[in-house]
Interface confidence: low
Amino acid sequence: KGMHAAQPAVVLASSRGVASFVCEYGSSGNAAEVRVTMLRQAGSQMTEVCAATYTVEDELAFLDDSTCTGTSSGNKVNLTIQGLRAMGTGLYICKVELMYPPPYYVGMGNGTQIYVIDPEPCPDSD
């Protein structure tokens, strides 16, 4: 079943290569198990950046080696991507799946364009 997911259109990553945005999904009831997937679209190619499953009574937990972190509150998920470089500029799409209880719902946002500007190297100091 279809579900609406909303996310900001544009986000500028910090000089340290960190970008955060909120992904909000429309839900008629309380889902016990929610899966959030971050996808990066470059041209016609779509790749998975990271994914996490969380529950209403638990914190959003990405794998230890993931480039993403996040927190959840109700039907909002605050996602943070780390280690971004200029080549990481692109459209990042938030996909939300309400896994449990039935029925299953899935929603995809329109994407957040993340702009990453690599910092200028510091000049050597004598």
């Epitope: 016990a32 198990e33 529950t55 638990d58 449990y100 209880p101 039935p102 299953y104």
Partner: antibody, heavy 121, light 107 residues
Amino acid sequence: QVQLQQPGTELVKPGASVKLSCKASGYTFTSYWMHWVKQRPGQGLEWIGNINPSNGGTRFNEKFKNKATLTEDKSSSTAYMQLSSLTSEDSAVYYCARSNYGSGWAWFAYWGQGTLVTVSA
Amino acid sequence: DIQMNQSPSSLSASLGDTITITCHASQNINVWLSWYQQKPGNIPKLLIYKSSNLHTGVPSRFSGSGSGTGFTLTISSLQPEDIATYYCQQGQSYPWTFGGGTKLEIK
């Protein structure tokens, strides 16, 4: 009240298949996932997989992916598990179990009586 | 898969005793652990969910605790009807896995 009815026993020959049933009553069948659990005689419990009765979606323990097929029939509120290419290792009690969403989606609050499958020539 | 190691595998205690069964997970499962009781010839019965929550109708002499990788089930004032095998089960990630069981006997 919630009830999960399973036939008591099934005697099958090695290499054959068997289809176990679990008839649910006392609740809305499509609102809760149904799980299947294996218990060999005198042994512990093993989770086989589950089915979402609202759309037929399944999840499996990899160990049972080529052994078990889970289906459902919404019209009769019945979940099915077919076991194929049976060997003596498949002789066990098979339970269907339902989670209790109100008290945690991963826990099995309701169990069928179990079907004893005996594989013997 | 997450491995669930239960100890002891068997336990003998006297009526009125307080006993503890432990369950160790091979990786962090937060509080997503449940305990079941299975009496001889019977079906498993849910006792505790989410580590410490008592399921409806379960006597208060049963209690659970723990988080992360270490969990305990405590039965205080042991009763004759507590003779059973007890299993822990993790609900953190698929496939759900059970401990090997602890068989409780009365001395």
